[in-house]
Interface confidence: low
């Protein structure tokens, strides 16, 4: 018996569907076939857990959080035994093994490895103003979304003509922050921040108003 | 309207680096929620998506051509463009840009397309 | 090899209705991602016919529609006209290749 070399790893949006692919050769007939999928979840990898089990001609569930989300993509028996996740979750991300026997066969290897990341779209970032927003202050725009895997980057605009941020700012894409020095009238205005990551984006925006001194009354 | 169009030589020799440039008019490419990507045609045969980027630099790859791709954005020309390296005679192809929304299950169809370019790799 | 599968030729005569078949698996069209369906003139670019499995951009004819149940979408054309002689192909995002995947193509000839 011999496990198929897995692709390695599979990433899937959280919410859709993910296919988990494990695939065996045999000399013997399908008639004792078992086949176990376990998994190591990344937030517990001292917990493995079972996610579906096949014996004795009978489907059994695994861990509870599986319930009713998880099957075999074909009929069984048979010689692929990929599973498919619904409704993935942030918790599935692990590392899942399929363990195959089927007697009277044996030797090879049994293990098939593929690991499942599940992907999350930055959430509606927020947008705020740091320091005094006075004629000549340093102002530093925050942008952070709470929710992102991978980690969002985060870009800031400035909604004119340009869509170019000020001569006197810089911009951290990694922090999501923007540090404009010495602000002028010119940096005032509408300024937008674009969260995203491999499978999304999401936005906020900020309005940026330099105070001017009011002349003094003689 | 938004108009994509590809820019390139059309012969590259075996194991040389494929460059295509795509340039993005009527529209700017650093509109919200919009990728753009590169999709192949081999003469006579079917379409292959390659690869896609987002402005701020995001990419991601068809995973059987990961190793020699680079995809890479220019805002401040309004381009996108494609490296692909050691190509090989099975690289001739028609090569297309194309604009397309990221939103799982919801509208990640390639919208709006370039004419094309067609290049060729022979020595 | 293609990922989604369509056969390779359709005939049919003017005025009647062909139907342009894409079959996938369980990682791209049965795992409930959308088809999007696409026609192509020789020496031409692709062109949007059908996004989201059965929404048509504008200016695209309501005698093109598309239709998903399982694993396979399909693509129904009626009142066949002579111009819808073109390349059709599908495409779908696929969770197991991370990425999108088109089928090889299906030829439509007008008799």
């Known amino acids: 018996l011999e496990v198929s070399e897995s692709p390695g790893s599979v990433q899937v949006a959280r919410g859709q569907t993910a296919v988990l692919p494990c695939a065996f050769s045999t000399s013997a007939a399908l008639l004792n076939l078992n086949v176990i999928w376990m998994v190591i979840p990344l937030s517990n990898a001292n917990q493995p857990e079972q996610v579906i089990l096949y014996q004795g001609g009978q489907m059994f569930d695994g861990a509870l959080r599986f319930h009713g989300r998880v099957g075999f993509t074909g009929t069984m028996p048979a010689t692929n035994v990929s599973i498919f996740i619904n409704n993935t979750q942030l918790s599935d991300t692990g590392t899942y093994q399929c363990l195959v026997n089927n007697l009277p066969d044996r030797g090879g290897r049994n293990i098939g490895v593929t690991g499942l990341t599940v992907l999350v779209p930055p959430s509606a970032p927020q947008c705020q103003i740091q320091g005094s927003q006075d004629l000549g202050s340093d102002v530093i725009l925050l942008c952070s979304s709470e929710e992102g895997i991978p980690r969002p980057t985060y870009l800031w605009e400035k909604l004119d003509n340009t869509l170019k941020l000020p001569p006197t700012a810089t911009q951290d894409q990694v922090q999501g922050t923007v540090t404009i020095r010495n602000i002028s009238a010119l940096s005032s205005g509408l300024y937008q921040c674009v969260a995203s990551n491999a499978i999304g984006t999401s936005t906020c925006l900020l309005d940026l108003q330099v105070i001017s001194p009011q002349p003094r009354s003689v | 309207q938004l108009q994509l169009q590809e820019s390139g030589p059309g012969l590259v020799k075996p194991s040389e680096t494929l460059s295509l440039t795509c340039t993005v008019s009527g529209g700017s490419i650093s509109s919200s929620g919009y990728y753009w990507g590169w999709i192949r045609q081999p003469p006579g045969k079917g379409l292959e998506w390659i690869g896609s980027i987002y402005y701020s630099g995001s990419t991601y790859y068809n995973p059987s051509l990961k190793s020699r791709v680079t995809i890479s954005v220019d805002t401040s020309k309004n381009q996108f463009s494609l490296k692909l390296s050691s190509v090989t005679a099975a690289d001739t192809a028609v090569y297309y840009c194309?604009?397309?929304?990221?939103?799982?299950?919801?509208?990640?169809?390639?919208?709006?397309w370039g004419q094309g370019t067609m290049v060729t790799v022979s020595s | 090899q293609a990922v989604l599968t369509q056969p390779p030729s359709v005939s049919g005569a003017p005025g009647e209705r062909v139907t342009l078949s894409c079959t996938g698996t369980s990682s791209n069209v049965g795992a409930d991602f959308d088809v999007h369906w696409y026609q192509q003139f020789p020496g031409t670019a692709p062109r949007l016919l059908i996004f989201g499995s059965d929404n048509r951009p504008s200016g695209v004819p309501d005698r093109f529609s598309g239709s998903k149940s399982g694993t396979s979408a399909s693509l129904a054309i009626t009142g066949l006209q002579v111009e819808d002689e073109a390349d059709y192909y599908c495409q779908a995002y696929d969770v197991r290749l991370s990425g999108w995947v088109f089928g090889g193509g299906t030829k439509l000839t007008v008799l």
């Open positions: 194309a604009r397309h929304r990221v939103r799982f299950g919801e509208f990640d169809a390639f919208d709006i």
